[in-house]
């Protein structure tokens, strides 16, 4: 269910509607549930959940990271340079989250709402950023590739990328949550 | 209400690794936002975070500590583990376990076990 | 990590108000709400006072306040009882997932 169609939300008709950080906030968290999902039918499946993060690091994917230059950590923070990164990086994450839709047997529904909620969540920052012209959009031709690349990998790599698709997704939707509530 | 109950030998020998068990009452250590840290305080001195493991199983560790700590769950027993490896007579100290109620933007221990002495000496 | 900066030790008579500060690097206290206050008697394990920043934690009197500036917190306690005597702890979330602890001060109740 997504943010705002909850039973709770029926029941009290007259409570104050959410501000636009409320919104973000339930927004994010409903993805990392969502995440939360699609992890633990990952790790029934297989032993990926037991790999160290070191031994995980080691791979070629260039997943979007929060680094102190982003200007989101508490070192140097910057309310807008730190949008900037945010919606970027979701906006790079957008060809991972499409990778993620065919990797899922119970849980495809869930894999679909984690991406539909993600673009829903880049809409409202989007409204909340004085500066779109920083945001670099990634271009569609290298996603198309990389979509292709991914998909060719042998099963236990694609376990591999999904896994760490997932976590690393939860890390950085947690980083800019914690960031945005400064904001 | 929740309890949470340190458990694991008091006595360690340098060069061995301490193994320690947090055992949690009153609600599961899978429930949504919740994390499980191990913080240690050794005697006379003050409280030293070790790490955390969130609602997900994701663990995340002291960057003093990082190279000798693992950290692991049993979600059918309700437990959490604490592994540290290669301990020397600095490691003696009461280790606690604790729950933070919300790793995403919470940071702070509501529940705690009441400690367990552990001692390194051959 | 380094940890929190905190005076080993403060002291005050009942009735009387006492502030503990806590201070820490900018990636520390600096910009984001996440500071919490323990409370530990002797022998027992810490108790949960305040969290992000000002939140009393369920059943803690009103007796009990923190606040922020900057890069320093602080922890004060109105009306001092003699019950009040014991440690205290600040403590802080730290980039990617990390917490770290204040030294911890004394507090004696005279008299």
């Known amino acids: 269910v997504p943010p705002g169609e909850d039973s709770k939300d029926v029941a009290a008709p007259h409570r104050q509607p959410l501000t636009s950080s409320e919104r973000i906030d339930k927004q994010i968290r409903y993805i990392l549930d969502g995440i939360s999902a699609l992890r633990k039918e990952t790790c029934n499946k297989s032993n990926m959940c037991e790999s160290s993060k070191e031994a995980l690091a080691e791979n070629n994917l260039n997943l979007p990271k929060m680094a102190e230059k982003d200007g989101c950590f508490q070192s140097g923070f910057n309310e807008e340079t730190c949008l900037v990164k945010i919606i970027t990086g979701l906006l790079e994450f957008e060809v991972y989250l499409e990778y993620l839709q065919n990797r899922f047997e119970s849980s495809e529904e869930q894999a679909r709402a984690v991406q539909m909620s993600t673009k829903v969540l880049i809409q409202f920052l989007q409204k909340k950023a004085k500066n779109l012209d920083a945001i670099t959009t990634p271009d569609p031709t290298t996603n198309a590739s990389l979509l292709t690349k991914l998909q060719a990998q042998n099963q236990w790599l694609q376990d591999m990328t999904t896994h760490l698709i997932l976590r690393s997704f939860k890390e950085f939707l947690q980083s800019s949550l914690r960031a945005l509530r400064q904001m | 209400e929740v309890q949470l109950q340190e458990s694991g030998p008091g006595l360690v020998k340098p060069s061995q690794t301490l193994s320690l068990t947090c055992t949690v009452s009153?609600?599961?250590?899978?429930?949504?936002?919740?994390?499980w840290s191990w913080i240690r305080q050794p005697p006379g001195k003050g409280l030293e975070w070790m790490g955390v493991?969130?609602?997900?199983?994701?663990?995340y560790y002291s960057p003093s500590l990082k190279s000798r700590t693992s950290i692991s769950w049993d979600t059918s027993k309700n437990q959490f583990s604490l592994q540290l490896s290669s301990v020397t007579p600095e490691d003696t100290a009461v280790y606690y376990c604790?729950?933070?109620?919300?790793?995403?933007?919470?940071?702070?221990?509501?529940?705690w076990g009441q400690g367990t002495q552990v001692t390194v000496s051959s | 990590q380094s940890a929190l900066t905190q005076p080993p030790l403060v002291s005050g008579t009942p009735g009387q108000t006492v502030t503990i500060s806590c201070a820490g690097a900018n990636n520390d206290i600096g910009t984001y709400a996440y500071v919490s206050w323990y409370q530990q008697l002797p022998g027992t394990a810490p108790k949960l006072l305040i969290y992000k920043v000002t939140t009393r934690a369920s059943g803690i009197p009103s007796r009990f306040s923190g606040s922020k500036s900057g890069n320093t917190a602080s922890l004060t306690i109105s009306g001092l009882q003699s019950e009040d005597e014991a440690d205290y702890y600040c403590a802080s979330y730290r980039n990617f997932n990390n917490a770290v602890f204040g030294r911890g001060t004394h507090l004696t109740v005279l008299g």
């Open positions: 009153g609600g599961s250590i899978t429930t949504r936002y919740y994390a």
């Open positions: 604790a729950r933070d109620p919300d790793v995403v933007t919470g940071f702070h221990y509501d529940y």
């Open positions: 493991i969130d609602y997900d199983g994701d663990t």
